[in-house]
Interface confidence: medium
């Protein structure tokens, strides 16, 4: 069955600065990933950024930067502006979708213990959309 | 197999106006492209407008300043607002979608017919 899996870094240089990194483990290829915060995509959660293999990437403030790190797996790198860190508490959501195999979604947030420029461990929670 | 519902055409005197909906009957992944186009009798299929999932909006020079595009709260449905219709605009409407984007692989509505009588 793929798997969706979601780790959300605070930077150890900048503490206003956040990166997420999500990943496909499974078959087939990545036609789409969709990321968003607050939620899981269409159900109360907002988008941050989507990545086309080949149309290229949109992103949303507060997202900075969007980019393929492999053929499987995308970072996102986030700017928080206000003071009080209100990534830190927040859930992201990665949707990656292989056409017309369906889509696979998980959720992942910054652990309260962790301490900036160490990666949350891979924790998904996988939302199966379809198959 | 996706399967594209049309609805909304009709017939309408010119200078009205009428908007057309389409809903993608397939949900389980998100449609990157999806759009109008239009055949009038004893024409080629046309392109009239597309939107893409991020929202990037292409409407064609004939239409721009009175039809509008856009994609529904619920994924993969698509509207098209018409407004300002002329005699000209009469024609088969079909929605399209491209999952890839990239027209690998598109789909077709049946088609609704639009009438604009003068």
């Known amino acids: 069955t793929p798997e969706v899996w979601v780790q959300v870094q605070m930077e150890a240089t900048e503490l206003s600065s956040f990166t997420v990194h999500c990943g496909f483990l499974g078959p087939g290829s990545i036609s789409l990933v969709t990321v968003s915060w607050g939620g899981p995509d269409g159900a109360g959660g907002t988008k941050l950024a989507v990545l086309h293999p080949e149309l290229g990437t949109r992103q949303w403030a507060p997202a900075r930067q969007a980019r393929w790190e492999t053929q499987s797996s995308i970072s996102l790198a986030l700017e928080d502006s206000g003071a009080s860190s209100p990534f830190a508490n927040t859930t992201f959501c990665c949707k990656f979708a292989s056409f017309p195999e369906g889509s696979w979604e998980s959720c992942g947030s910054l652990p309260p213990s962790s301490d900036p420029g160490l990666s949350a461990p891979p924790t998904p929670v996988p939302i199966l959309r379809a198959d | 197999q996706v399967q594209l519902v049309e609805s909304g055409g009709g017939l309408v005197q010119a200078g009205g106006s009428l908007r057309l909906s389409c809903a993608a009957s397939?949900?389980?992944?998100?449609?990157?492209?999806m759009g109008w186009y239009r055949q009038a009798p004893g024409k080629d299929r046309e392109l009239v407008a597309t939107i893409t999932y991020t929202g990037s909006i292409k409407i064609v020079d004939s239409v721009k300043d009175r039809f509008t595009i856009s994609r529904g709260d619920a994924k993969n449905t698509v509207s098209l607002q018409m407004s300002s219709l002329k005699p000209e605009d009469t024609a088969v409407y079909f929605c399209?979608?491209?999952?890839?984007?990239?027209?690998?692989?598109?789909?077709w509505g049946q088609g609704t017919q639009v009438t604009v009588s003068s």
């Open positions: 397939e949900t389980y992944f998100d449609l990157y492209v």
């Open positions: 399209n979608a491209d999952p890839s984007g990239l027209g690998r692989k598109v789909y």
